[in-house]
């Protein structure tokens, strides 16, 4: 499955929108920074079959979409930017879902992929727990925004590697 070039552009647009969503200076929130334990090893793309990589990417985008689709998120961000950001993520999910269906038919996805998906889910659970503990404060959301920018950039890099494999 070849991810369309528009998918890559959509990923960049999502990152830019996320950058624009910042409402307060990140530098006023330095003390709130947190180690969420991003599962970097799941995104290095070396030990993966293509089907595995795509399903991990899908989980990453799905969890990001879910996080920014909550009521608390709606209250935290400027509505039009949030809607554009969600639309970009939704389009990426559609692209990836089409690929997951195609690729799973080609390769049997081993059990280790479930571990990778679980690692991504636990990562987002830690983010949600942090937001809850910080009572969804503006700084907590700002820290999470920066964290998601980091994780989305890992996703972008994995997608680039997948395209090079094609």
């Amino acid at each position: 499955c070849d991810l369309p070039q528009t998918h890559s552009l959509g990923n960049r647009r999502a990152l830019i929108l996320l950058a624009q969503m910042g409402r307060i200076s990140h530098f006023s929130c330095l003390k709130d920074r947190h180690d969420f334990g991003f599962p970097e090893e799941e995104f290095d793309g070396h030990q993966f079959q293509k089907a595995q990589a795509i399903s991990v990417l899908h989980e990453m985008i799905q969890q990001t979409f879910n996080l920014f689709s909550t009521e608390d998120s709606s209250a935290a961000w400027e509505q039009s930017l949030l809607e554009k950001f969600s639309t970009e993520l939704y389009q990426q999910l559609n692209d990836l879902e089409a690929c997951v269906i195609q690729e799973v038919g080609v390769e049997e996805t081993p059990l280790m992929n479930e571990d990778s998906i679980l690692a991504v889910r636990k990562y987002f659970q830690r983010i949600t727990l942090y937001l809850t503990e910080k009572k969804y404060s503006p700084c907590a959301w700002e820290v999470v925004r920066a964290e998601i920018m980091r994780s989305l950039s890992f996703s972008t890099n994995l997608q680039k590697r997948l395209r090079r494999k094609d």
């Epitope: 830019i16 950058a19 530098f27 920074r33 920066a146 980091r150 950039s153």
Partner: antibody, heavy 120, light 111 residues
């Protein structure tokens, strides 16, 4: 590969202003903070400030807030720093540096530096 | 501002031996799982190069003979075994709060 190309050596008079550039290539310019760092001859490093080209957000070291102005033109993938009211103390090498991993605020790629000499 | 005090100011180490550079912050730069201290190497006439980030993480492409440790206010850069190409000035930098500051540098000479 990531490259930061800075403008050349500048000679300026005391009291004047200078504007230096830093052209980025090999990465998404709009999604990385860009720091500026000062190094006087034979001395250590000083952090001046940082700009986010994606939205123009800037943060300065208070020591430099009346001295330096950071801007970026995304269409040209270029960041700029303007130094005003120059004195001998401003004679230094100025580096633009790409921020690493969003909120770690460390610097992974550096330009080759712009040398500013202030002399009457 | 957080002041970073590096020691020693200079040291000479024999080839193959261990070089240890210390960086002490006037205030803690650690918070919630991360220590916001980083290390750079600068060779004469060159730009600084990132070696270690977040106190102990080796930057990609940096040889494994470089290692960092510490938390709170006390941090250490170790180089072992030292090689000739390691002759340089080493700087620590914190990003715990604004403004970010650098240490005054440690010049390493290889004997």
């Amino acid at each position: 590969q990531v490259q930061l190309q800075e403008s050349g050596t500048v000679l300026a008079r005391p009291g004047a202003s200078v504007k230096m550039s830093c052209k980025a290539s090999g990465y998404s310019f709009t999604t990385y903070w860009m720091h500026w760092v000062k190094q006087r001859p034979g001395q250590g490093l000083e952090w001046i400030g940082v700009i986010y080209p994606g939205n123009g957000d800037t943060t300065y070291n208070q020591k430099f807030k009346d001295k330096a102005k950071l801007t970026a033109v995304t269409s040209a993938n270029t960041a700029y720093m303007e130094l005003s009211s120059l004195t001998n103390e401003d004679s230094a090498v100025y580096f633009c540096t790409r921020n690493y991993k969003y909120d770690y605020y460390t610097m992974d790629y550096w330009g080759q530096g712009t040398t500013v000499t202030v002399s009457s | 501002d957080i002041v970073l005090t590096q020691s020693p100011a200079s040291l000479a180490v024999s080839l193959g031996q261990r070089a240890t550079i210390s960086c002490r912050a006037s205030k803690s730069v650690s918070t919630s799982g991360h220590s916001y201290m980083h290390w750079y190497q600068q060779k004469p006439g060159q730009t600084p190069k990132l070696l270690i980030y977040l106190a102990s993480n080796l930057e990609s492409g940096v040889p494994a003979r470089f290692s960092g440790s510490g938390s709170g206010t006390d941090f250490t850069l170790n180089i072992h075994p030292v090689e000739e190409e390691d002759a340089a000035t080493y700087y620590c930098q914190h990003s715990g709060e604004l403004p970010f500051t650098f240490g005054s540098g440690t010049k390493l000479e290889i004997k």
